[in-house]
Interface confidence: low
């Protein structure tokens, strides 16, 4: 038998420095977690102790903090090189700065293979990007070889900016021929490494013949066997075992997100490359693991350029700003309320005595809120904090929509509720009640909107044939997160102001903020 140790990360999202337990900015260093310096310590410890070790990343290193805002991916290449990653799969966020923003800082600089079998380049890009990413890579590990085949969410064109010269194919359809090719090359130990979410990871394990292990990302799935060490609730055991269509037991793993854990999976193969056993658990990278001094020194050197971003206090919060995905993708969260209030405030235009304002409504995809802000840092809110909350550099735009389109949008908001998907809407100037016991497409039981043509604003039922103005992220106006009905049915779309600027201006204006959860979004069963 031959034993392989797979160390894996996914959805690190620019958390190069250690963070607080909820993956926002580190406030109390003795309780902070993750970061590349701490990760390196643990990786090196395992490399010294065990003979056959692979360090893999399943995508979405890009986007999430000021590190990416400033360094635009150069930091990813530099520190992944320093940690000596063996391979990385492309995630959707690797395309956030377009293909050029992937090629120059990362693909050309990485000293490790970057993989995706289901992304095919066409047109002039094909020659430009040729060889810079690969469908698979055969890696020597000890006396054996291991094949790594990559995949990326086929939803990437809806989630990021890959342009028109990359085609994202169905994962399973694209993976099978590459795995077959590896088999013809006498590679009998094959890992599928990719970024399509846990449901697709399980399907790949089930459907793709010849894949021995699946290492995934995108859904920030936390798997754990036994008592979990932190706040994350496991979605299943680690590894999650899928029985393939041809009867094999295929381990599937993922390691939550934000560099908080290092996935640790030990696989035992027989001489024919069959998995005999698999076991392990994510390792919580808490403060009991010291930060490697050389990597930490390098982080501090790179940090200098960022410091002028983090010193400017915009205002103060006296409450915790809950921007966690656990809240904002499932229920009303006060970070969503803050952002929506800022969006409306930014659009105040008292132009007509009949109207208190020309627009009263805001919608905001919960998936666009990427971080909380802890009030215990003296209440300070900085540009850097907001860049972690709103890292995508989008704009908050003004659209005109019919009530019927809004109703469809709110149905879409909860059509697959409970899967931590980004389309769950945060709101302003809207009161919505959902009944999740009803079938998808018929879950909105009450939808009231704040009047504009009134001297005292109050909530009235949405009228299907009335035209309403709504402030929303350009991402939604462009049909992102599946809101195709907005893109297809909007009557007018005006580009707005940069998202961080809107919120920072509002906070500067308010000076002290204390947004609450106040019943904008409610759930009922049966008669409400």
């Amino acid at each position: 038998a031959w034993e392989l140790t797979i160390l894996h990360t996914n959805d690190v999202h620019s958390r190069l420095e250690q963070t607080s337990e909820d993956s926002s900015k580190c406030v109390n260093a003795s309780r902070c977690m993750g970061g590349v310096a701490r990760l390196f310590t643990k990786v090196q410890q395992i490399r010294r102790a065990e003979p056959n070790v692979l360090l893999l990343d399943a995508g979405d290193q890009y986007q999430g903090t000021i590190w990416f805002t400033v360094y635009k991916g150069a930091e990813v290449a530099h520190f992944m090189n320093a940690l000596r990653y063996d391979a990385m799969a492309l995630g959707n966020h690797e395309f956030d700065n377009g293909v050029e923003g992937l090629i120059e800082p990362l693909l050309k600089e990485a000293k490790f293979p970057i993989l995706s079998a289901n992304i095919k380049a066409k047109g002039p890009l094909a020659s430009q990007i040729s060889g810079l990413y690969l469908p698979y890579k055969v890696l020597p590990v000890g006396d054996e070889v291991v094949g790594i085949v990559g995949y990326t969410s086929k939803e990437t064109p809806f989630l990021s900016n890959p342009g028109t010269n990359l085609v994202f194919e169905d994962e399973i359809t694209a993976l099978q021929p590459e795995v077959d090719k590896l088999k013809t090359l006498n590679v009998n130990k094959i890992i599928a490494l990719g970024h399509s979410g846990f449901e697709m990871d399980k399907l790949i394990a089930q459907k793709v013949r010849g894949v021995d292990v699946v290492v995934g990302g995108h859904s920030n799935t936390f798997l754990y066997t036994g008592n979990p060490p932190s706040k994350e609730v496991p979605a299943g055991k680690y590894p999650f075992i899928v029985t393939s269509d041809d009867g094999r037991k295929v381990p599937v793993v993922q390691a939550y997100a934000f560099g908080k854990y290092l996935g640790y999976l030990k696989i035992e193969f027989d001489e024919r490359g069959n998995v005999i056993s698999s076991h392990g658990n994510p390792i919580l990278l808490n403060s009991s693991i010291p930060e490697d001094p050389s990597i930490k020194a390098d982080i501090n050197k790179w940090r200098i350029k960022l410091d002028n971003y983090s010193t400017q206090e915009l205002g103060k919060t006296i409450v915790y700003l809950d921007g966690s995905s656990q809240s904002c993708r499932f229920r009303e969260c006060n970070m969503g309320n803050l952002i929506c209030d800022a969006m409306i405030n930014n659009n105040l235009r008292h132009t007509d005595e009949m109207f208190w304002n020309h627009v009263s409504m805001c919608i905001l995809n919960g998936g666009g809120i990427r971080s909380p802000i802890d009030e215990r840092n003296n209440g300070t809110i900085t540009w850097e904090n907001l860049a972690a909350v709103l890292p995508f550099g989008g704009t908050f735009d003004l659209v005109q929509l019919k009530g019927s389109t809004l109703k469809k949008a709110f149905e879409h908001s909860v059509h697959r509720y409970g899967q931590s998907t980004g389309e769950f809407l945060q709101v302003g100037g809207i009161h919505v009640v959902y009944d999740l016991s009803r079938k998808p497409g018929d879950r909105v039981v009450k939808l009231d909107v704040l009047c504009t043509k009134c001297r005292v604003p109050s909530y009235d039922p949405l009228k299907m044939d009335e035209v309403y103005k709504v402030i929303l992220p350009n991402f939604l106006a462009n049909g992102g997160d599946g809101f195709q009905m907005i893109k297809d049915e909007l009557l007018r779309h005006d580009s707005g102001d940069q998202d961080i600027n809107v919120v920072s201006t509002y906070i500067s204006k308010m000076k002290v903020i204390y947004p609450a959860v106040e019943g904008r979004i409610k759930f009922s069963t049966g008669s409400h």
Epitope: S495, I500, N501
Partner: antibody
């Protein structure tokens, strides 16, 4: 295609009032979010923003010139008018109108009109 | 009001050179900065907005960076048509412009 064109007198006397008209095409000032501004540039010097007007008739003026400036629009004729009172030789400049984008940067400019203040 | 101090006021360079122009705001303007190119007798043309976003149709040799008070316009490899005057502009409060940088052929 967006175009803007400034018109007005090439020469005005000190203490007189300057009236400039910006005639534009390719967009409508009744479109939500749209704005048109005026910027001037004395010969060989820097640009100075004067005023702008929004689609909803909201008006903004440079604080240092506010008492002398009036901006207005005629949406149906696709025109924006700027008046500047009590002209002085230091007001000699090329006056540009421009379409406001997002907050207040200017993507589309007219070719400019040179106004000389002299007796 | 917010002063925008641009440096240098003039600059001589050759085709192919890398050129950097800086602009300092008298107070924090976040990333609310645009850069313009102006040729003699012509209106300014926007190159960069929101500090680092290249305007549609602007060649990739032009790039902007900065946040807060310090901003930079970089031309990676000067072309003959790039000799002109460059202005920065903040729009965090009412718009103000830098005094300009005249880029001349060496």
């Amino acid at each position: 295609q967006v175009t803007l064109r400034e018109s007005g007198p090439a020469l005005v006397k000190p203490t007189q009032t300057l009236t400039l008209t910006c005639t534009f095409s390719g967009f409508s000032l009744s479109t939500s979010g749209m704005g048109v501004g005026w910027i001037r540039q004395p010969p060989g010097k820097a640009l100075e923003w004067l005023a702008h007007i929004w689609w909803d008739d909201d008006k903004y003026y440079n604080p240092s010139l506010k008492t002398r400036l009036t901006i207005s629009k005629d949406t149906s004729r696709n025109q924006v008018v700027l008046t500047m009172t009590n002209m002085d030789p230091v007001d000699t400049a090329t006056y540009y109108c421009a379409r406001r984008e997002r907050w207040a940067w200017f993507a589309y400019w007219g070719q400019g009109t040179l106004v000389t203040v002299s007796s | 009001d917010i002063q925008m101090t641009q440096s240098p006021s003039s600059l001589s360079a050759s085709v192919g050179d890398r050129v950097t122009i800086t602009c300092r705001a008298s107070q924090n303007v976040f990333t609310n900065v645009a850069w313009y190119q102006q040729k003699p007798g012509k209106a300014p043309k926007v190159l960069i907005y929101s500090a680092s976003y290249r305007y549609s149709g602007v060649p990739s040799r032009f790039s902007g960076s900065g946040s807060g008070t310090d901003f930079t316009l970089t031309i990676s490899s000067l072309q003959p048509e790039d000799f002109a005057t460059y202005f920065c502009q903040q729009y965090n409060s009412y718009p103000t412009f830098g005094q300009g940088t005249k880029l001349e052929i060496k």
